[in-house]
Amino acid sequence: ETDEEPEEPGRRGSFVEMVDNLRGKSGQGYYVEMTVGSPPQTLNILVDTGSSNFAVGAAPHPFLHRYYQRQLSSTYRDLRKGVYVPYTQGKWEGELGTDLVSIPHGPNVTVRANIAAITESDKFFINGSNWEGILGLAYAEIARPDDSLEPFFDSLVKQTHVPNLFSLQLCGAGFPLNQSEVLASVGGSMIIGGIDHSLYTGSLWYTPIRREWYYEVIIVRVEINGQDLKMDCKEYNYDKSIVDSGTTNLRLPKKVFEAAVKSIKAASSTEKFPDGFWLGEQLVCWQAGTTPWNIFPVISLYLMGEVTNQSFRITILPQQYLRPVEDVATSQDDCYKFAISQSSTGTVMGAVIMEGFYVVFDRARKRIGFAVSACHVHDEFRTAAVEGPFVTLDMEDCGYNIPQTDESTLMT
């Protein structure tokens, strides 16, 4: 546990102006209000630690209420360069430029940042999500079109005195929110440049950032209700493990997913759930207020610690991995989707994980901190937990080394 080390000024304490600056919900992402251009144009921007471009809708789109109008900004500069970002499903493309950017409920600074003005997209914007752009907070290595395009956070740190660190508290509601409730609800906090003690309980535990591209970490052990999955730990990180606020689910490599589901099924076998539930296709419902949380196991991920042969564990509850869904057809019940799914690109610790914890992205010290979130949903019997230290040997062997090819095959 390394929370007691001295910190440089400005790194810790209270950041009142930034608390509660996020809105949204896990299924459609968490967004922060930003202003772009002169005079300032206000947009809601998805906070995404799984990508590295600042990209905003810059043309009319049926799912956008508003968009960035470059022609109205006196400070816009065209970089005369296009950018095309394909996803496994969908894509966005646009034109690169720079403009003045600030975060009203963030540090009191304005920075000139690279902006991708999205002119065309497919399966990118989400109907009803209320965000118009994306703030990629990961590293330059995965920026598009290449790593020479400086990400927003790098620009912010270079141009200001803001410390090279941010922290996220994503607050799942624990119940489904309709559109008006989302607009009015608090979704959490993005603390830029520091750590706010009011947002977590207990101690912060840190895991090294393995490589500065995504926020890559190493998982060394997985337990379901305290039972070790007993897999070669390389499988947990095949081909990587990342912390990604832009993903809803906890996504696991195929073999790990199958083993985890088998174990969760066994632990919750007092009820018979349809196959489609484990696939995320069918909802399961209980009479309002009767969800049997106790029949579902807790899930613990052990992460490499900062000290040799030392690890710590983060434990989530079913309140995190069963996502509440509103369906008019079954509105008299409490219905849920299973929010753990299969991945072909490694483990993704998405909102399902992050909603249990206050997560510190300490870029300056190349580490990610976890503490129990002050806003996580729990019951009177169990709570999310961050605990350690545990002795774990040969943790370096748990990392998977992605074969390097001449051509980048990165597909976000």
């Epitope: 499903q89 196959d275 296709e281 909802l283 219905c335």
Partner: antibody
């Protein structure tokens, strides 16, 4: 209000193919899977398969694996079912349905008639 | 595949009566059974899920019961608008399968 609007009736020749559509509205399209169901007179309901609009993942009834292909266009919130190499056995009413718990919402039906 | 058997193809009843439609699964499906009503020329309408839960807006004269392999849809105080075919469905495992249907006739 959740609605699934299906395309109109089709009269097609044997050996050809047809593409049926199902346009969804009233909910977040990518949050729920879409199923397709076949109904022949006096033969009840047969599940053809399903698609997840968020990533186009599909699962088929083995019986229809070589007959039906499901696709989505999220920009128009529309799911499609392509039926190939049509025979008289494919003459039927086809429904799309939205998942939730079982199939709470159904489209209004598309009649496909295969005739020379 | 799980076979859902509705042994009665037709049932005759009178307005105001109580009628029970049965359905048997070839293997244990827990309570992962739904019931649908289909009127002539219309799409199926969802009535019951999880064997016994009514979908929103479904009149409370429709009641579902059962678990494991034996399921029943009961309509109490039958109304003329209940003239329809009723299908059970298991959604416990792929492939999803339906019963052959029971046509309710009003005397």
């Amino acid at each position: 209000e959740v609605q699934l609007q299906q395309s109109g009736a089709e009269l097609v020749r044997p050996g050809t193919s047809v593409k049926l559509s199902c346009k969804a509205s009233g909910y977040t399209f990518t949050s729920y899977w879409i199923h397709w169901v076949k109904q022949r007179p006096g033969q009840g309901l047969e599940w053809i398969g399903m698609i997840d609009p968020s990533d186009s993942y599909t699962k088929y009834n083995q019986k229809f694996k070589d007959k039906a292909t499901l696709t989505v266009d999220t920009s128009s919130s529309t799911t499609y079912m392509h039926l190939s190499s049509l025979t008289s056995e494919d003459s039927a009413v086809y429904y799309c349905a939205r998942s939730g718990v079982a199939f709470p919402y159904w489209g209004q039906r598309t009649l496909v008639t295969v005739s020379a | 595949d799980i076979v859902m058997t509705q042994s009665q193809k037709f049932m005759s009843t009178s307005v105001g009566d109580r009628v029970s439609v049965t359905c048997k699964a070839s293997q244990n499906v827990g309570t992962n059974v739904a019931w649908y009503q289909q009127k002539p020329g219309q799409s199926p309408k969802a009535l019951i899920y999880s064997a016994s839960h009514r979908y929103s807006g479904v009149p409370d004269r429709f009641t579902g019961s059962g678990s494991g392999t034996d399921f029943t849809l009961t309509i109490s105080n039958v109304q003329s608008e209940d003239l329809a075919e009723y299908f059970c469905q298991q959604y416990n495992s792929y492939m999803y399968t339906f019963g052959g249907g029971t046509k309710l006739e009003i005397k």
